[in-house]
């Protein structure tokens, strides 16, 4: 602890200017102070001042007052300063004494000469209230104030607590009159050394070094850290906690990058057509009659299916087509003839046949010939009857496929590791796929080589449209129909001017 | 009861950079009780305080280093650092790692036992 | 910058008191701490916020701080106490040490 007793003299009357032995003073008593404070004694007693002690110089003659101001080079009020705790008890001895020497320094005069003296026990608690007192004896008075106060930087009851006030990294804080700390703004904490974050800086993915501050701690982002950091590179997520990317509907993929609905996003179907999403970026068109392509962006020749016949030249239209009927034939598809046998009708050897009692005809055409008028040569490899890549060669009357290593058959269907074994039972159909062979079973029949009589027929329903042939077999109770040329489709519903490159598997 | 110790290499060559780590056992350095502080004496000299650190990052130099340097944390390992760059003859010295409490006024009441750096080419 | 100044050495008998101290501007307005260190060890804090000693500390350490001068104070000192003594404060965010007083 740290303080100071504190007393004032404030007046001093001896009018008779006598010593305390009866004798006056000539020409009058010069007056200085001696002031011993120590601890509390019953009976005050000589001895050492064990809370301090001062001297003041010649403050007047006889009687004066003092004024609450430098005097000389002494100090009213008079300092005691004490480093311990104030006890809150004390006993003082004021003595008044007469010098005939130095005004500054009577101490060191010798022939000094009590004049009076006080003595006070009792209690006085810290506070800055001075308590007023008035000692009277025979031939003197004197009025005094005294008090305690704490030393700079100690507060409390007894001067105990010591308290600076600081800001600095240990502490921003000033100190109450209790000696308490009161934090300055921003700061709390025991010692105010705990920065007060920005308001809703959340408190665990936050934090501050100075008041109204929000730093993020790692995986955390926004004003008030409350919002998480997706993965790196996560494009159409987001997270819930840190480095996650959960995707947003549609999109997948580790970074949500990968276009799960890729028909909606970028509706790459044309004229009509229906759009089939197929995993990441894959899609399929499914077209309108009339046209083709990946997207159904072709739009397919109205001509495309020959529709003229006898000849007849066909013309696209807007949404048709229009057949130029060749001399003697007339109708939509220049199907009606005006010429008869007599008029010599058949090409190439081929024999006429009247119709309809003369009004029509019809030719029967010489091998290598066709068309209603025998007009056209046969090229038997118009059809593309090779598969597997097989070359086909017209060989006068008949063609032959021309197989690729690998593969054999009249038209090259028959892988020859796999369908040469003739795998499939009862008649069925060996196809010859990158896994292995697969067998096209006849009705009745199923199993991965038609081994399985079934008792229920799946073609029995008439699945197959556009007279496409049914079988069954290539898994139980399903079925597959073999599209004829110019239908696509599982169930060949489909008109695409296209050969299937597989039976469509219902 | 806490323990400091300084680890890095004894010599560093003039114009480097001295790099020293501190790890911390016996307590954990994210308290918000303590500063962990970096301070040097040279060879048959006095104490020179070079800067501390919180555990969330705040730094505090001396001013008349602050221009070399860095010193940072790593709570996962219990370890702080201390980088000072543009070295000279001048910070040849024992430094020490400490640790300076909040409750004490900033007085640093555990220290390393100091690691000698001397800086020769 | 803050500058803390104390006396080289300080001599004292066995039993005596000793009385280090530690000038600075307005050094009374700053809490001080004192630190022991003797050759080739570590220094010791032996007292903090001007007068408080840490656990294990013996009472013959004592401190006081006001006005411009810190003084730390060895009563009854013993062998054992040979060091030298570094004062040290905080001026703003920034330690200062003392230039340190040999006691023998």
């Known amino acids: 602890g740290s303080g100071i007793f504190q007393l004032r003299l404030q007046e001093f009357v001896n009018q008779r200017g006598m010593l305390a032995n009866g004798q006056s003073c000539e020409p009058g008593c010069r007056t200085f102070f001696r002031i011993c404070l120590k601890h509390f004694q019953a009976t005050f007693s000589e001895g050492p001042c064990t809370f301090g002690n001062v001297s003041t110089p010649v403050l007047g003659t006889n009687s004066f007052v003092v004024r609450d101001k430098n005097s000389g080079s002494g100090r009213n009020p008079l300092q005691l300063p004490f480093n311990f705790t104030w006890p809150g008890t004390f006993s003082l001895n004021i003595q008044a004494w007469h010098t005939p020497g130095d005004d500054l320094r009577p101490e060191t005069s010798p022939g000094n000469s009590l004049i009076s003296q006080i003595i006070i026990q009792g209690s006085l608690a810290v506070g800055k209230i001075w308590r007023t007192d008035e000692q009277n004896d025979t031939l003197t008075r004197l009025s005094y104030s005294y008090r305690v106060i704490c030393s700079d930087n100690y507060y409390g009851e007894s001067c105990s607590r010591l308290c600076k006030k600081r800001d600095d990294h240990f502490g921003h804080y000033e100190c109450q009159p209790d000696g308490s700390l009161s934090c300055l703004p921003g700061w709390t904490g025991k010692y105010c050394d705990q920065p007060i974050c920005l308001s809703g800086c959340h408190e665990q993915n936050g934090y501050c070094s100075k008041p109204d501050e929000c730093i993020c701690r790692p995986g955390w982002q926004g004003r008030l850290c409350n919002e998480c950091i997706p993965h790196n590179g996560c494009r159409h997520g987001t997270c819930s906690i840190p480095w996650q990317c959960a995707c947003d509907e549609g999109w997948g993929g580790l970074f949500c990058d990968q276009d799960l609905n890729y028909c909606t996003h970028h509706s790459p179907c044309k004229n009509g057509s229906t759009c089939s999403n197929s995993g990441p970026k894959g899609y399929t068109c499914t077209c309108l009659p009339g046209y083709t392509g990946e997207h159904c962006e072709l739009g397919l020749s109205k001509c495309a299916s020959n529709p003229c016949r006898n000849g007849g030249s066909c013309k696209d239209q807007e949404n048709s087509y229009h057949c130029l009927c060749p001399p003697g034939y007339y109708g939509q598809h220049c199907e009606h003839s005006t010429l008869t046998c007599a008029d010599s009708p058949c090409f190439n050897g081929g024999s006429c046949r009247e119709r309809n009692q003369g009004s029509s005809y019809a030719c029967e055409c010489p091998p290598n010939f066709t068309g209603s008028n025998c007009e056209k040569k046969v090229d038997r490899c118009t059809s593309n009857p090779c598969a597997n890549g097989g070359q086909c060669q017209n060989r006068g009357p008949s063609r032959t496929c021309r197989c690729r290593p690998g593969f054999t058959g009249t038209h090259c269907e028959l892988h020859i590791s796999d369908c040469a074994r003739s795998p499939c039972a009862h008649g069925g159909t060996c196809h010859d796929l990158e896994n292995g062979p697969v067998c096209t079973c006849p009705a009745g029949f199923s199993g991965r080589r038609c081994e399985v009589r079934i008792t229920h027929d799946a073609c029995a329903s008439g699945p197959c449209f556009n007279g496409a042939t049914c079988y069954t077999g290539l898994s139980p109770n399903n079925f597959v129909c073999n599209c004829p040329y110019g239908f696509v489709g599982s169930r060949c519903e489909f008109p695409v001017g296209l050969p299937p490159s597989f039976p469509w598997v219902a | 009861e806490v323990q400091l110790q300084e680890s890095g290499p004894g010599l560093v060559k003039p114009s480097e950079t001295l790099s020293l780590t501190c790890t911390v056992s016996g307590g954990s350095i994210s308290s918000s009780n303590y500063y962990w502080g970096w301070i040097r004496q040279p060879p048959g000299k006095g104490l020179e305080w070079i800067g501390d650190?919180?555990?969330?990052?705040?730094?505090y130099y001396n001013p008349s280093l602050k221009s070399r340097v860095t010193i940072s944390v790593d709570t996962s390992k219990n370890q702080f650092s201390l980088k000072l760059s543009s070295v000279t003859a001048a910070d040849t010295a024992v430094y020490y790692c400490?640790?300076?409490?909040?409750?004490f006024g900033g007085g640093a009441d555990s220290w390393g036992q100091g690691t000698l750096v001397t800086v020769s080419s | 910058s803050y500058e803390l100044t104390q006396p080289p050495s300080v001599s004292v008998s066995p039993g005596q008191t000793a009385s280090i101290t530690c000038s600075g501007d307005?050094?009374?307005?700053?809490?001080v701490s004192w630190y022991q260190q003797k050759p080739g060890q570590s220094p010791v804090l032996v007292i903090y916020?001007?007068?408080t000693r840490p656990s294990g500390i013996p009472e013959r350490f004592s401190g006081s701080n006001s006005g411009d001068t810190a003084t730390l104070t060895i009563s009854g000192t013993q062998p054992m106490d040979e060091a030298d003594y570094y004062c040290q404060a905080w001026d703003s965010e920034s330690g200062v040490f003392g230039s340190g007083t040999k006691v023998t």
């Open positions: 650190i919180y555990y969330t990052g705040s730094t």
């Open positions: 916020e001007d007068s």
């Open positions: 400490a640790r300076e409490a909040v409750s």
């Open positions: 307005g050094l009374g307005d700053k809490y």
